[in-house]
Amino acid sequence: MAPWPELENAQPNPGKFIEGASGPQSSIPAKDKEASKTNDNGTPVAKTELLPSYSALVLIEEHPEGTDPWDLPELQDTGIKWSERDTKGKTLCIFQGVGKFILLLGFLYLFVCSLDVLSSAFQLVGGKVAGQFFSNNSIMSNPVAGLVIGVLVTVMVQSSSTSSSIIVSMVASSLLTVRAAIPIIMGANIGTSITNTIVALMQAGDRNEFRRAFAGATVHDFFNWLSVFVLLPLEAATHYLEILTNLVLETFKFQNGEDAPDILKVITDPFTKLIIQLDKKVIQQIAMGDSAAQNKSLIKIWCKSITNVTEMNVTVPSTDNCTSPSYCWTDGIQTWTIQNVTQKENIAKCQHIFVNFSLPDLAVGIILLTVSLVVLCGCLIMIVKLLGSVLRGQVATVIKKTLNTDFPFPFAWLTGYLAILVGAGMTFIVQSSSVFTSAMTPLIGIGVISIERAYPLTLGSNIGTTTTAILAALASPGNTLRSSLQIALCHFFFNISGILLWYPIPFTRLPIRLAKGLGNISAKYRWFAVFYLIFFFFVTPLTVFGLSLAGWPVLVGVGVPIILLLLLVLCLRMLQFRCPRILPLKLRDWNFLPLWMHSLKPWDNVISLATTCFQRRCCCCCRVCCRVCCMVCGCKCCRCSKCCRDQGEEEEEKEQDIPVKASGAFDNAAMSKECQDEGKGQVEVLSMKALSNTTVF
């Protein structure tokens, strides 16, 4: 990563816990927490005090004095108190509550369904390409290439279970060794963490909300990347995962069992199957090198078919291919035998939207990608608004206390491990870590779950998805049982190893600090979130893959200098932060470099320039949409987009402290103020506050 000083805003002290959360987060009493903050030298630091010149804290923290953006917000109850309501009001309030709960479940259902459709869309767009990545066996023997193939394929198909099943098939048919499969599994683990990062992008409307949501989502990414950074070289050197899983398989004689219950799929499938159904075997066939599969469509057309097994006379190369002499004969030239030929007869077509469209996979994929992202975004906004209106006052306090409070001393350390178990259990129930972490993201954003609590839940989710894979492996047929089980166990032990590395000791909880740093940068420069996503999940893996195609010498020749440079920057950063006095004056900060090399400000200016042009065209449409929304919501004082005004006017507004958002790369400033007096008769969910930064509305 570039040595951007914005990163310095990451919480440097792992011992510093969330202040807003009730309960004993640390041994320091709440009122003394402010006083207890210290800088490097151990001297107290007030929040308003500027840290030494080597810190860039001031660049990020735009919040008012005395507040920490990482504090969980106090969700105040803006409505009328229960005791002050009359019978009619109370009845209405109960109906509103029930209505909100039903709406919340409805939007949550749509949210999960849209994630499923999003996965299908990604498979339609990139599934065949993903399959082709696997078909290059020579590259996959290179662990680094294997890793990036795992990342790319899982990002492309939006499903680690799909990529895992391809790997299992390849191992079972000896196209791939378990040794070569392990880095791919590691890559698949990274790839699966993109989903909740995409979901977090949808919360970019409110800076602090986005800060928390994006950090909460990327804590998963950082955990996976850091785990791979340590465990991939370790595995390449020692093959400990391969040896350990072999040992487990030999020690315990595994029998075929039952697959994990698909609780969530049972609910979502009836709806998603009306939208699209895919034939996942096509990707698998491409991966296995079946050239005929390249021309097949991923879209399932026939859902009901009968298989006729008929005895047919077929020619075979020689009598060696005969089942027995009784079933073999010759016509004088060729040897014939009787074989059971399975013929598939299609009976009924599938019942999804695209079944009768003769559109190519790419077109259907793009349509579904667009629609699912819009629905995902809309659902997320509505979930956030609903949760925001429901989680107020006492309810919020209880939930926040339950989720973020540690066990009493001396068992406080156990809380995180319980959270890991909860995360694993929840993921096991919903059968998808993507769904669980994505559903958690808005809760982190609105401040119901802290990053510190989200971290073990996410780690648990990683474990949960591997236990699901182990059960799926146990349910697989005999010929693939061993290979699928070994791969599932590799996945499991990889995550266990990662947890042992980055969780037990608070100091090693590096993903939290890195995620917070990224959250801070992304809150200030929202375009950076998109850059991060593209750079880490597409550009870097594709570059490494490209270099792998060129061969080991090229990969090492290009990779080693980059890694050395990164290590140099990291060491220098550590010295600047820990003991700047040993460094020459010039190296105590990054000012010796051109501004664009150590600050995102110049880049922000460039991106702002590029997006202003696009924004001006788009903003009038935004304003119309915004007004329509206001009418639908019934907000009397809804404030619509100011983006059609002159830039100068906006600057004045900002200076006057009017709460209109800056025209950042993503801003719409749509519906930016909630009508406080509206809350009495309105269903609060519809009195929208800062609906979204995206251009959905």
Epitope: S324, P325, Y327, W329, T330, D331, I333, T335
Partner: antibody, heavy 119, light 107 residues
């Protein structure tokens, strides 16, 4: 109806070659194998080999390998069997027979061609 | 090569008799056996294939049975035109081979 008409009787000297033809009609020539079977005077039937006119693929009895050549002319729906290095024991009636599709039973036979080898 | 041994080599019977000709294979040939009838100076004529299936146009008095190594051709009621030489043939593997023949004569 299916008909197999063979060429006339031949008298050959030892060491010479003989080429017997078998003209077919009444069915699709390229779908069935054509077999050649011989019968020495007062003896049983002996399989020489077969040809698949569709591709020209052949299979010969090991006993005749190197001496026998079978060819097919799809334009005239005719098959040929050439036997070289003739010996007196090659004196026999040579039959062409159509093989049933997918197995080695022979359903239609030519009238036979007598080849006499004598010095 | 697979050897086929027919028995008897000669058989005398009267019109109306039930006649059975057997054919033994030196190894398992499944059901890949055919039966032919040949009259003097004529080409053989297919009677039975797949050990039991009658060829089109063959009278129902002709029937075949057996599998593996033992096969039989049965003529349920001999007719004057049935006096001829009968051959069995295996097509289990190359080269195709024939039995030495069974000559059926009038008693």
């Amino acid at each position: 109806q299916v008909q197999l008409v063979q060429s006339g009787a031949e008298v050959k000297k030892p060491g010479a070659s003989v080429k017997v033809s078998c003209k077919t009609s009444g069915y699709t020539f390229t779908t069935n194998n054509m077999h050649w079977v011989r019968q020495a005077p007062g003896q049983g039937l002996e399989w020489i080999g077969a040809i698949y006119p569709g591709s020209g693929a052949t299979a010969y009895n090991q006993k005749f390998k190197g001496r026998v050549t079978m060819t097919a002319d799809t334009s005239t729906s005719t098959v040929y069997m050439e036997l070289s290095s003739l010996r007196s024991e090659d004196t026999a009636v040579y039959y062409c027979a159509r093989g049933m599709y997918g197995h080695g039973a022979m359903d239609y036979w030519g009238q036979g061609t007598l080849v006499t080898v004598s010095s | 090569d697979i050897q086929l041994t027919q028995s008897p080599s000669f058989l005398s019977a009267s019109v109306g008799d039930r006649v059975t000709i057997t054919c033994k294979a030196s190894q398992d040939v499944g059901t890949a056996v055919a039966w032919y009838q040949q009259k003097p100076g004529k080409a053989p004529k297919l009677l039975i294939y797949w050990a039991t299936t009658r060829h089109s146009g063959v009278p129902s008095r002709f029937s075949g049975s057996g599998s593996g190594t033992e096969f039989t051709l049965t003529i349920s009621s001999l007719q004057p035109e049935d006096f001829a030489t009968y051959y069995c043939q295996q097509y289990s593997s190359n080269p195709l081979t024939f039995g030495q023949g069974t000559k059926l004569e009038i008693k």
